[in-house]
Interface confidence: low
């Protein structure tokens, strides 16, 4: 019969032969012959693949190194790799998340608009009129000016983006 | 052979201060974090510090935090532990131990002998 | 603050099984190691990222870890395996040693 020249799925050709792929977890240690199947390996304990294959080497799981303000995620099997996050206040610099950053704060006259989460930075807004922020913080929103007239004061001194009214006794008339 | 040696242990007053150094020999001592971990008499192990290879990154334990300091001089292979406003209760043998690398997981794969740190009037 | 867990003392005869606990909340979800340390010596590392073997410990050594508990197992213990054992792990970029557990060979 004609050598074939392609193979089914979960085969590879190799010596005009088709031969099994070796299932994700395990690496190839050596190609089937006319009278033997594909012989195949489970990855190390520290080692991956997460494809039907015939790779020799299985890949190291990834290290999320604490140095970078990496944690694990997500421990890595035999057929999935680890997946890395940013501890607490930080996030990924990349969607690889290689490495983490510090999240931003949000500056005095601005608010917290979307707190951080492990991939994404914080989205800070400007304080519009009738709020404000008067700290940077990373968890804040702008904080609404008080309502002087609920309380039965006046407005003393005006609120800006950065500061609250400040609120007084009204000026009684004495008879 | 892979080998660690603390030095600069012994008596000191309440509030006092010490420097503890640890030589480094037998591997390359700029590629891997380093640590401290103290053991208090009949006492488990207690981790005081660590720092990364490049001496940027630096953790400590809350009960040292702002007291301690540890750092590195690549070119000599040599860690160090400044120790100030030491407490009795910083009493003990402190180990120097080398982080076991890339694929170790933050592991502690050789440790030295240690050296002992008594703080008492 | 995170904390692990392990018993005071574990007792075993010789050549049989000593399994050693050592339990943290997630405890599976981080990497575990293990140190074997006797009297006046420093601490060994006998198992790093949960289960496997620094080069030179014995394959009687083994370890795993899910849930919220690792757990150290000694088959065919050996007189030289008594010792204190702590487990360690990394959480929010501090270590944290379990209190040790004293192993005693019967």
């Known amino acids: 019969p004609e050598p074939p020249t392609a193979c089914r799925e979960k085969q590879y050709l190799i010596n005009s032969q088709c031969c099994s792929l070796c299932q994700p977890g395990q690496k190839l240690v050596s190609d089937c012959t006319e009278f033997t199947e594909t012989e195949c390996l489970p990855c190390g304990e520290s080692e991956f693949l997460d494809t039907w294959n015939r790779e020799t080497h299985c890949h190291q799981h990834k290290y999320c190194d604490p140095n970078l303000g990496l944690r694990v995620q997500q421990k890595g099997t035999s057929e999935t790799d680890t997946i890395c996050t940013c501890e607490e206040g930080w996030h990924c610099t990349s969607e690889a998340c290689e490495s983490c950053v510090l999240h931003r704060s949000c500056s005095p006259g601005f608010g917290v608009k979307q707190i951080a989460t492990g991939v994404s930075d914080t989205i800070c807004e400007p304080c519009p009129v009738g709020f404000f922020s008067n700290v940077s913080s990373a968890f804040e929103k702008c904080h609404p000016w008080t309502s002087c007239e609920t309380k039965d004061l006046v407005v003393q001194q005006a609120g800006t983006n950065k500061t609250d009214v400040v609120c007084g006794p009204q000026d009684r008339l004495r008879a | 052979e892979v080998q660690l040696v603390e030095s600069g242990g012994g008596l000191v007053q309440p509030g006092g201060s010490l420097r503890l150094s640890c030589a480094a020999s037998?591997?390359?001592?700029?590629?891997?974090?380093m640590s401290w971990v103290r053991q208090a008499p009949g006492r488990g192990l207690e981790w005081v510090s660590t720092i990364n290879n490049s001496g940027g990154g630096t953790y400590y334990a809350d009960s040292v935090k702002g007291r301690f300091t540890i750092s590195r001089d690549n070119s000599k292979n040599t860690l160090y532990l400044h120790m100030n406003s030491l407490r009795a209760e910083d009493t003990a043998v402190y180990y120097c131990?080398?982080?076991?690398?890339?694929?170790?997981?933050?592991?502690?794969?050789?440790w030295g002998q240690g050296t002992t740190v008594t703080v008492s009037s | 603050s995170y904390e692990l867990t392990q018993p005071p003392s574990v007792s075993v005869s010789p050549g049989q099984t000593a399994s050693i606990t050592c339990s943290g909340d997630?405890?599976?979800?981080?990497?575990a190691c293990w140190y074997q340390q006797k009297p006046g010596q420093s601490p060994v590392l006998v198992i790093y990222?949960?289960?496997r073997r620094p080069s030179g410990i014995p394959e009687r050594f083994s370890g795993s870890n899910s849930g919220n508990t690792a757990t150290l197992t000694i088959s065919g213990t050996q007189a030289m395996d008594e010792a204190d054992y702590y487990c360690?792990?990394?959480?929010?970029?501090?270590?944290?040693f379990g209190g040790g557990t004293k192993l005693t060979v019967l």
């Open positions: 990222q949960d289960s």
């Open positions: 131990a080398k982080e076991g690398g890339k694929y170790y997981y933050y592991a502690m794969d050789v």
């Open positions: 360690q792990a990394w959480a929010s970029s501090t270590v944290v």
């Open positions: 037998g591997f390359t001592f700029s590629s891997y974090a």
């Open positions: 997630k405890l599976g979800d981080k990497y």
